[in-house]
């Protein structure tokens, strides 16, 4: 089977959503956990993560082969404390298989804005607190 993990971010007003999406087959969901770590280059695990989620066992319909499971970590107001390196990972508690997504970073600037870099879908995202828009 093939399990794919991607990272993305979205902004809703002052909130920043960090999203880990895993695409997988039904039969691959058993025992799999997706999790998001911060500043954990070597020991990212469900136990040290910011949030974890078990993969869906059911896509909700029967006419599809793949399921997407989505972990969303919401930062209500980004502060300098949120600056750092983040990574989406997944692990099977049955087989021990580990998946590691690309590292991405939040950089809080002196002007009160923040930048998210390293995301594969959008190479560079900049968010402004003052205007609350994607800049």
């Amino acid at each position: 089977g093939c399990i794919n993990i991607t990272s993305s971010a979205s902004q809703e007003g002052t909130r920043l959503n960090l999203i880990c999406t895993v695409w997988h087959k039904k039969e691959e969901a058993e025992g799999f956990v997706v999790f998001l770590c911060k500043d954990r280059s070597g020991d990212c695990s469900p136990e040290t993560s910011l949030k974890q989620l078990r993969l869906k066992r059911d896509p909700g319909i029967d006419g599809v082969g793949e399921i997407s499971s989505q972990l969303m970590f919401t930062i209500s107001q980004v502060t300098p404390l949120h600056s750092g390196t983040y990574q989406c990972c997944a692990r099977s508690q049955k087989s021990g298989i580990r998946l590691q997504g690309h590292f991405f970073s939040i950089l809080f600037t002196e002007t009160g804005n923040y930048t998210v870099t390293g995301l594969k879908q959008r190479q560079h995202l900049e968010f402004s607190h003052n205007e609350g828009t994607l800049s």
Partner: antibody
């Protein structure tokens, strides 16, 4: 045993909103899709949408997108369906129902008792 | 959206007779079809899953068949408690949809 217990009957005025709850017990709430279905008096069954409480993935039929909001509270194993901008045509019995695990059951194997919504000025 | 068309809308039969209910899908849905029974004032009850698979606790007189676009629910010998409304429902794709229902009434 699996049980879905819904909130009581509601009477609302046109333009108002309603939030119906469905408390689940007897199974792992986060592992199953919860459906919301309605039935107008003397009519058939109409699927509104469904939510997967494990990751809050929600799907809606086009007719209700933007007017219905499905949520789930993992801590209390309760699913909610909020319907806004109510009109008289929304008068119906609203059901929550659990979808059985794919390829094993697939259909809606457990149903709530139904919540009657009356929209009248 | 997959449209499910049930026929007939009403079926008038006597106890002991055989009932044959039809459900037709607007496009192929493999065997991803389920049947429900609903009695007045009650929530629907799952009768048959995946077109032909039986459900624990449902009498053996209820059976289902079909695949693709044409499906049939058969009640081999109607009992008094079987007079009700029957719905089909597809789980092949979003949005999930129901058929309009067939009412089985006493002749």
């Amino acid at each position: 045993q699996v049980q879905l217990v819904q909130s009581g009957a509601e009477v609302k005025k046109p333009g108002a909103s309603v939030k119906v709850s469905c408390k689940a017990s007897g199974y792992t709430f986060t592992d199953y899709w919860m459906q919301w279905i309605r039935q107008a008096p003397g009519q058939g069954l109409e699927w509104i949408g469904s939510i997967y409480p494990g990751d809050d993935d929600a799907r809606y039929t086009q007719k209700f997108r933007g007017r219905a909001t499905l949520t789930a509270d993992k801590s209390t194993s309760t699913a909610y369906m909020e319907l806004s901008s109510l009109r008289s045509e929304d008068t119906a019995v609203y059901y929550c129902a659990r979808r059985g695990i794919a390829a094993v059951v697939g259909g809606f194997d457990y149903w709530g008792q139904g919540t009657t919504l009356t929209v009248s000025s | 959206e997959i449209v499910l068309t049930q026929s007939p809308a009403t079926l008038s039969l006597s106890p002991g007779e055989r009932a044959t209910l039809s459900c037709r899908a607007s496009q192929s849905i493999s065997n991803h079809l389920h049947w429900y029974q609903q009695k007045p004032g009650q929530a629907p009850r799952l009768l048959i899953k995946y077109a032909s698979q039986s459900i624990s606790g449902i009498p053996a007189r209820f059976s289902g068949s079909g695949s693709g676009t044409d499906f049939t629910l058969t009640i081999s010998s109607l009992e008094p408690e079987d007079f009700a409304v029957y719905f089909c429902q597809q789980s092949n794709s979003w949005p999930l949809t129901f058929g309009g229902g067939t009412k089985v009434e006493i002749k």
